[in-house]
Interface confidence: medium
Amino acid sequence: VPRWRQQWSGPGTTKRFPETVLARCVKYTEIHPEMRHVDCQSVWDAFKGAFISKHPCNITEEDYQPLMKLGTQTVPCNKILLWSRIKDLAHQFTQVQRDMFTLEDTLLGYLADDLTWCGEFNTSKINYQSCPDWRKDCSNNPVSVFWKTVSRRFAEAACDVVHVMLNGSRSKIFDKNSTFGSVEVHNLQPEKVQTLEAWVIHGGREDSRDLCQDPTIKELESIISKRNIQFSCKNIYRPDKFLQCVKNPEDSSCTSEI
């Protein structure tokens, strides 16, 4: 008799999830010498232990502590790039500007990027059919709690000038409900972080407005200032060109017109 399985509103665990996590771990530790000591089997075991046999709406940050411990990593605290709703450009940027790091450039962020996972209460099975949706089902699901945990730790580690890339094409350039707005902003340490500099990425080629004047940016500035951290904002026009000009300053499209 087939066992009854909870149907959630979100997509199920990513196909070949265990193999993907293990393979990513091996690849990351090969590329990053400072993480060569990491035992990827132990990492997978700790990852699995955080959600397997647990109700997928009852996951806590504590569940991820063994994984956090194994994935402890030091990145230059003054070279951190946060992002909100503009992940691809942020990742392209750190591929070009190799001394800056997004969360997904760290081991734990790299392991989980774009993946979904959940288990079932009291069984060792991974649920490949469906997983809880943050809005429709529950917020304390394995994926959301993971990103909340690693995002908090990443923000806590930041120092000096922290940059955040924001999507100027969205109606809410700064969204209080995003991971950046709800977790990272509130976990920057005022005693370590001097300035948060927002880079507002313009969408349209001819969009020359000052998006740093946007009401949601003013809201971000207010939140940050109340935390005794200075705030700065830059308009970044033509994001394709921004990347190119950081990567290759001699390129003719950079040395010339906007």
Partner: antibody, heavy 119, light 107 residues
């Protein structure tokens, strides 16, 4: 080495015309945006005009719009500024500069050529 | 157009820190540059993209830019730093704008 040399300055009467040239060497002129910046005697710097590397875009300060024309000849590695309907207030040292377009700064400057508009 | 305002003059004793301000409506939303000009010479770029230094410019030159003020800081000012300094930025139309200039005197 990277060098910009301006020429064509001199004394001209109000309402007259003058064409300034700027000869570039030591870098790939055809790949760079260029600017003219001027400085009246004892005064500060004033941006005059920019031109993109393909001449497809030109920008002018309000004070010279309609009277000055910036152009370039990439085959001759030369930047030009055609100045018409000159006024006394156009009297200045005119500098040509290589500008970095995306982040908007001028990283190489010529030594300047003096334009005097007087009757 | 954005207007950039600089103090006409700043004085500093040798070895001390000189700070030259450049104020403009939301200048911090755009990138600022600084130029040094000595008498009878062409300007020289000393800071670009707010706080980057061209090669050959001493480490004592640094910059910052936030809100309505960009600042050029010269730590351990030397006699040879005596010059006029100009800030420069651009507005949303991408026109260049220069500040009025500041005469730095090393006492």
């Amino acid at each position: 080495q990277v060098q910009l040399v301006e020429s064509g300055g001199g004394l001209v009467q109000p309402g007259g015309s003058l064409r300034l040239s700027c000869a570039a060497s030591g870098f790939t002129f055809s790949s760079n945006g260029m600017s003219w910046v001027r400085q009246a005697p004892g005064k500060g710097l004033e941006w005059v005009s920019n031109i993109s590397y393909l001449s497809s875009s030109t920008y002018y300060a309000d004070s010279v719009k309609g009277r000055f024309t910036i152009s370039r000849d990439n085959s001759k590695n030369t930047l030009y500024l055609q100045m018409n309907s000159l006024r006394a207030e156009d009297t200045a040292v005119y500098y040509c500069a290589r500008f970095y377009g995306y982040f908007n700064y001028a990283d190489v400057w010529g030594q300047g050529t003096l334009v005097t508009v007087s009757s | 157009d954005i207007e950039l305002t600089q103090p006409p003059s700043v004085s500093v004793a040798p070895g001390q820190t000189a700070r030259i301000s450049c104020s403009g409506d939301n200048i911090g939303h755009y990138y600022a540059s600084w130029y040094q000009q000595k008498p009878g010479q062409a300007p020289v770029l000393v800071i670009y993209r707010d706080n980057d230094r061209p090669s050959g410019i001493p480490e004592r030159f640094s910059g910052s830019n936030s809100g309505n003020t960009a600042t050029l800081t010269i730590s351990g000012t030397q006699a040879e730093d005596e010059a006029d300094y100009y800030c420069q930025s651009y507005d949303y139309l991408h026109d260049f704008v220069f500040g009025g200039g500041t005469k730095l005197t090393v006492l």
